[in-house]
Amino acid sequence: TLNSVLNSNAIKNLPPPLGGAAGHPGSAVSAAPGILYPGGNKYQTIDNYQPYPCAEDEECGTDEYCASPTRGGDAGVQICLACRKRRKRCMRHAMCCPGNYCKNGICVSSDQNHFRGEIEETITESFGNDHSTLDGYSRRTTLSSKMYHTKGQEGSVCLRSSDCASGLCCARHFWSKICKPVLKEGQVCTKHRRKGSHGLEIFQRCYCGEGLSCRIQKDHHQASNSSRLHTCQRH
């Protein structure tokens, strides 16, 4: 359960949340379920698009979302599916193609004029005054990053890495996701043996920066499997 996960010492005692795990090229963060994040339920559709295994939307391209390929299918088997166009059914914003968002179960246009009247449907925290706000809240960055002149700075709420400025990725922190720095050489990283094997992560790190990969630190080779420290190292 969520409660046991959030209260487990294994999760609480992870190293400081400075960024995430290594993933496939273009993946934002190490995969984790949608714990305490709005719209985290996985929607099931028959629109099988790209059979790339995933655990959450950030692992897929900007025109894709992560879900089970068959209605009523095994919730543990999820792949990247084509985003849903305007007027198609949806259950969360990430399901809709860029330039649209999910309102009352339907993907609708997120053009500026239309959106102002719908702001209550998708409010989130202000981004440190990065964006124009209404009643102290700002538009959710996930409604097509192209809408904004500035991308989320470190600490801004996000849904996917394309919402964040250069050098940052979108990674989970407690009940939310924020823009965190991509890892530099020597920084601790998270390496998962295989997709879906890592369980629930409350603090995610970003992936290692360009030219770096997440590998076992040399002086930790003799340590037990459970205590092996991974750091970002030159290829």
């Epitope: 400081p16 985290g40 989130t124 925290e125 600490g155 922190h173 407690f174």
Partner: antibody
């Protein structure tokens, strides 16, 4: 305007239970997580726990686990906190607070609970 | 749990003063530090999040700084409406914990 309206003050006997409500307006209830915070008289703030209204998932501070129960009623956009087996130590001001980021953005006005025989 | 310490429990200053309120964490919390203002009537507001990010609608006279274990909230030009108690909060590790508060009064 985002608003969190909490229920009124409560005077309860030791050993009894209390339910505090937090009615929200001005935003989509299921888009925000709801936190509960305790402030004992003249003291600091303590995080009790959090609930995700979209699916009912909860997480509690170990100190309050087993005595505090967080629930929501999506139809009325209201969050509830039940606190049982009350003692004088539970006399405090209780706040609800909604957020999406790792900070508490919007707070209720507080509900004063007094435990006295 | 991570302990948050605000060594100054009360502080007196004059209107127009530059006021700094300090907060120390018992371990490194990176930038995961928020500041809240509690007015005498009990109203609580978020001022600063992620160490230095100003929350929407908060006057620019408020600023946050520091990193690791030592942090500070600065009010550059104290006005009457700033009279309140200020709390720091770490959100680096569960459970989130708060400092004891610093009560700001007018001289």
């Amino acid at each position: 305007e985002v608003q969190l309206q909490q229920s009124g003050p409560e005077l309860v006997k030791p050993g009894a239970s209390v339910r505090i409500s937090c009615k929200t307006s001005g935003y989509t209830f299921t888009e925000y997580t709801m936190h509960w915070v305790k402030q004992s008289h003249g003291k600091s703030l303590e995080w009790i726990g959090v609930i995700d209204p979209s699916n009912g998932d909860t997480s509690y501070n170990q100190k309050f686990k087993g005595r505090a129960t967080l629930t929501v009623d999506k139809s009325s956009s209201t969050a509830y906190m039940d606190l049982r087996s009350l003692t004088s130590e539970d006399s405090a001001l209780y706040y609800c607070s909604s957020t999406t980021g790792p900070w508490f953005a919007c707070w209720g006005q507080g509900t004063l609970v007094t435990v006295s025989a | 749990d991570i302990q948050m310490t605000q060594t100054t429990s009360s502080l007196s200053a004059s209107l127009g003063d530059r006021v700094t309120i300090n907060c120390r964490a018992s371990q490194d919390i990176s930038n995961y530090l928020n500041w809240y203002q509690q007015k005498p009537d009990g109203t609580v507001k978020l001022l600063i999040y992620y160490k230095s990010r100003l929350h929407s609608g908060v006057p620019t006279r408020f600023s946050g700084s520091g990193s690791g274990t030592d942090f500070s909230l600065t009010i550059s030009n104290l006005v009457q409406e700033d009279i309140a108690t200020y709390f720091c909060q770490q959100v680096h590790t569960l459970p989130p914990t708060f400092g004891g508060g610093t009560k700001l009064e007018i001289k």
